[in-house]
């Protein structure tokens, strides 16, 4: 999959809107690798 | 608001270098990646670089590296774009931008800085 | 790199218009795709991220669509301030790479 910073903003974007924004405080695109998803 | 405001017009002399600063305000600067392009006179958009603010992480266009050189100033929320070795086809308005999730999602731009090289 | 083909390169149209302008990347970018518009003297704005998804605030006249290779954006109804230049943006790969434009002129 993409890893770009791009694609991890807009995968990472995607993932808060579905989760509600219940996430970690430091799950954001600059601390979060393309690993995380 | 968030905004994204770059520094003014600069006229540069071949073979000079000149840097751009990009003032980051209405989000966490250290959260999202700061991109940086360009646009020569009629010209279609160019990609130069990108840099992680949070850990100083950079990518290149290979056409610039060597060239451009991508900084930050975390305390400053403030983004650099240095282009060293000017010549006249470096003539362009030179754009920071960022997608941001918080507050709003949405890919922000600045207002552009014109770089002249002439001699 | 990969190359962003843009067509029509100019196109001349009225207010009402059904406006399409496609991109053709020269190898696969999944629907890694984005659209600009710019405006004479005007910084970039961006209207639609992943090949099909408006960002807040866009008008819903402007749609995007594809994957792969061939994406397409199109205005349903062209109103007086869409009259700007259209980019479609490849954030796949790096380099990102930008189409040549489409400038969309009052006929």
């Known amino acids: 999959s993409c890893n770009t910073a791009t694609c991890v903003t807009h995968r990472l974007a995607g993932l808060l809107s579905r989760s509600g924004g219940v996430v970690k405080d430091n799950f954001v695109p600059t601390n979060v690798g393309s690993e995380a998803f | 608001e968030v905004q994204l405001v770059q520094s003014g017009a600069e006229v540069k002399k071949p073979g000079a270098s000149v840097k751009v600063s990009c003032k980051a305000s209405?989000?966490?600067?250290?959260?999202?990646?700061m991109n940086w392009v360009r646009q020569a006179p009629g010209q279609r958009l160019e990609w130069i670089g990108d840099?992680?603010?949070?850990?100083?992480?950079?990518n290149y266009n290979q056409k610039f590296k060597g060239r451009a050189t991508l900084t930050v100033d975390k305390s400053a929320s403030t983004a650099y774009m240095e282009l060293s070795s000017l010549r006249s086809e470096d003539t362009a308005v030179y754009y920071c931008a960022s997608i941001i999730i918080v507050p709003n999602y949405f890919d922000y731009w600045g207002q552009g800085t014109t770089v002249t090289v002439s001699s | 790199d990969i190359q962003m083909t843009q067509s029509p390169s100019s196109l001349s149209a009225s207010v009402g218009d059904r406006v399409t302008i496609t991109c053709k990347a020269s190898q696969n970018v999944d629907t890694n795709v984005a659209w600009f518009q710019q405006k004479p003297g005007k910084s970039p704005k961006a209207l639609i991220y992943s090949a099909s998804y408006r960002y807040s605030g866009v008008p819903s006249r402007f749609s995007g669509s594809g994957s792969g290779t061939d994406f397409t954006l199109t205005i349903s109804s062209l109103q007086p301030e869409d009259f700007a230049t259209y980019y479609c943006q490849q954030y796949n790969n790096y380099p990102y790479t930008f189409g040549g434009g489409t400038k969309v002129e009052i006929k």
């Open positions: 209405g989000y966490t600067f250290t959260d999202y990646y």
């Open positions: 840099i992680n603010p949070n850990q100083g992480g950079t």
